[in-house]
Interface confidence: low
């Protein structure tokens, strides 16, 4: 009797595992065996699979063949008794498209309203992803386990940290990766838990903001207690993709070291252009806050999103304004090279009623003013993209009269 | 926020067509990639097929030959032509886009569709 050749055949690869599963075309006949060749793109030649030789079951692993995993290749198989089967040949493939990426390690660290999580590739060392390790991001899915109500939070990165959480609490999660870059999702890790500490008698400190005055930055910040010492650290965000980096060591801002006050100054060429995350602790000489919710501070934008400028003509009945570019000192205009939209404020002098304009043009009217009344206007610029989502603190109040009556033309 | 707006799902007799459509809106960025994913019930999200801003398409070994992704970068919209359907393509079809500045390494984003049925009846 002819061997059939099996006809189904799988190609599994998660992350640098390569498994081949395939049906047996004849159930009937016992003592069946199987093998494959493979074949590189632009050879004529076959060549023996290693570890999927006289295999009497369905499935085999050839995880240790040393592949170029961005070359096609293609496999054939028969079946082997006394006599062999003709070749099936399984379609081409190239072994990056078809992978798949394998469950990350998990690693949990509790505070008492917060979780860190490290979590890293399932193969270590992967020739799989090797090109693209740092481009890995993931999304977990976090629950109290006393609740099983999921919340998925997306687009992290290897050292990511969950703040707002219950202390003496136990959280679960499972974690999965993504590469965006080729469009690839993985499976979900096995779920972890871990409870949360006894509440600290300090709280972190809170609302933390950076603002540009002259040639300095102001950092400020919310805090519950008086007489507190606090300090700042930065970190350069890249990192966070990369946290076995030896780089990735947070570091103190010098003017920001056992502060008494809630704010601190330091110079703009402390950084250099990136951006960076901040963080803030608070000590009262016994205890220590755990570090607040990190920051991300953007030199391009925290230095140039300034203020914008602007000129104002004034009629009768409306004002034209007509807004620059910032000026740097040293009067030489910033260049904005993020399209902006301005947030126009008015009122009039002798009045609290404020009126508000947003508009993406340079040049702008507000209409339905009295002749001779004095308005007063302020404006400010904001990011009209929302993954930059900045706004500029206002520019100072400018006030002018409108004309007479019959100056509206 | 990122908007993306699916159409074209329904109901359709096997070996039929259909041709899914996902606009994108709510900012003034450009997806650096987008694609379609398919959740049939009581299994896991699965990959369809997705083009990315230099229009390399990627397929699904089980669609591939039978559907086709392309996009109008234009309109930000992605197109995917669905024909010879199978009863086992049945499922919610999502529209996905990456927003990627790959030089700035925090703002990669993905966004997801609400999902758009597709039926495919034997």
């Known amino acids: 009797k002819n061997l059939k050749s099996p006809q189904k055949v799988e190609v599994d690869i998660i992350d640098d595992n390569f498994i081949l599963r395939w049906n047996r075309s004849d159930e009937s006949v016992g003592n069946v065996t199987f093998s494959f060749d493979y074949q590189k793109t632009g050879m004529d030649n076959w060549i023996k699979l290693s570890g999927c030789q006289n295999i009497t079951s369905t499935k085999c692993n050839f995880s240790s063949l040393k592949l170029n995993v961005y070359e096609e290749i293609k496999l054939r198989i028969r079946a082997e008794k006394e006599n062999t089967s003709s070749w099936y040949e399984v379609d081409s493939f190239t072994p990056f498209r078809k992978a798949q990426i394998g469950p990350p390690e998990v690693h949990l660290e509790a505070e008492d309203k917060a979780i860190v999580i490290h979590i890293s590739p399932g193969t270590k060392d992967s020739v799989m992803w090797a090109l693209d390790g740092l481009s890995f991001t993931y999304s977990l899915v976090i629950w109290k386990n006393s609740s099983g109500v999921e919340e998925r939070i997306e687009n992290i990165y290897s050292r990511h940290k969950i703040y707002k959480l219950s202390p003496e609490t136990t959280y679960c999660l499972k974690v999965k990766a993504a590469l965006l870059t080729s469009w690839k999702i993985g499976v979900y890790s096995p779920v972890h838990c871990i409870k949360t500490t006894v509440e600290n008698e300090l709280p972190p400190p809170e609302n933390i903001e950076v603002s540009v005055q002259n040639q300095n930055y102001v950092l400020k910040w919310d805090y519950t207690y008086a007489n507190m010492t606090f300090q700042v650290q930065w970190l350069h965000a890249f990192l966070k993709r990369n946290p076995g980096n030896h780089l990735y060591k947070w570091k103190q801002i010098p003017d920001c070291e056992n502060v008494k006050t809630t704010q601190c100054v330091f110079p703009q060429n402390v950084f250099q252009k990136g951006i960076y995350l901040l963080r803030v602790q608070a000590s009262d000489g016994n205890n220590t806050s755990f570090w607040s919710e990190e920051i991300k501070f953007d030199t391009e934008i925290q230095a140039f999103l300034l203020p914008p400028v602007f000129n104002i003509r004034s009629l009768s009945d409306s004002f034209h304004i007509y807004i620059g570019a910032p000026k740097q000192s040293g009067n030489t205009p910033v260049i904005q090279d993020y399209p902006l939209i301005y947030e126009i404020i008015f009122w009039e002098n002798t009045s609290n009623a404020e009126r508000k304009i947003i508009e993406k043009k340079t040049d702008v009217t507000v209409p339905n003013l009295k002749p001779l009344t004095v308005y007063c206007v302020k404006a400010r610029a904001h990011t009209m993209d929302e993954k930059l989502n900045k706004s500029s603190v206002f520019s100072d109040a400018v006030c002018e009269k409108t004309k007479p009556g019959n100056t509206s033309k | 926020q990122v908007q993306l707006q699916e159409s074209g799902g329904g109901l359709v007799q096997a070996g039929g067509s259909l041709r899914l459509s996902c606009a994108a809106s709510?900012?003034?960025?450009?997806?650096?990639?987008m694609g379609w994913y398919r959740q049939a019930p009581g299994k896991e999200r699965e990959f369809v097929a997705t083009i990315d801003g230099g229009s390399t398409t990627n397929y699904a070994d089980s669609v591939k030959g039978r559907f086709t992704i392309s996009r109008d970068n234009a309109k930000n919209t992605v197109y995917l032509q669905m024909n010879s359907l199978k009863p086992e393509d049945t499922a919610v079809y999502y529209c996905?886009?990456?927003?990627?500045?790959?030089?700035?390494?925090?703002?990669?984003?993905?966004?997801w569709g609400q999902g758009t049925q597709v039926t495919v009846s034997s």
């Open positions: 709510g900012t003034i960025s450009k997806p650096w990639g």
């Open positions: 996905a886009a990456v927003y990627a500045d790959l030089d700035v390494v925090l703002y990669y984003h993905i966004y």
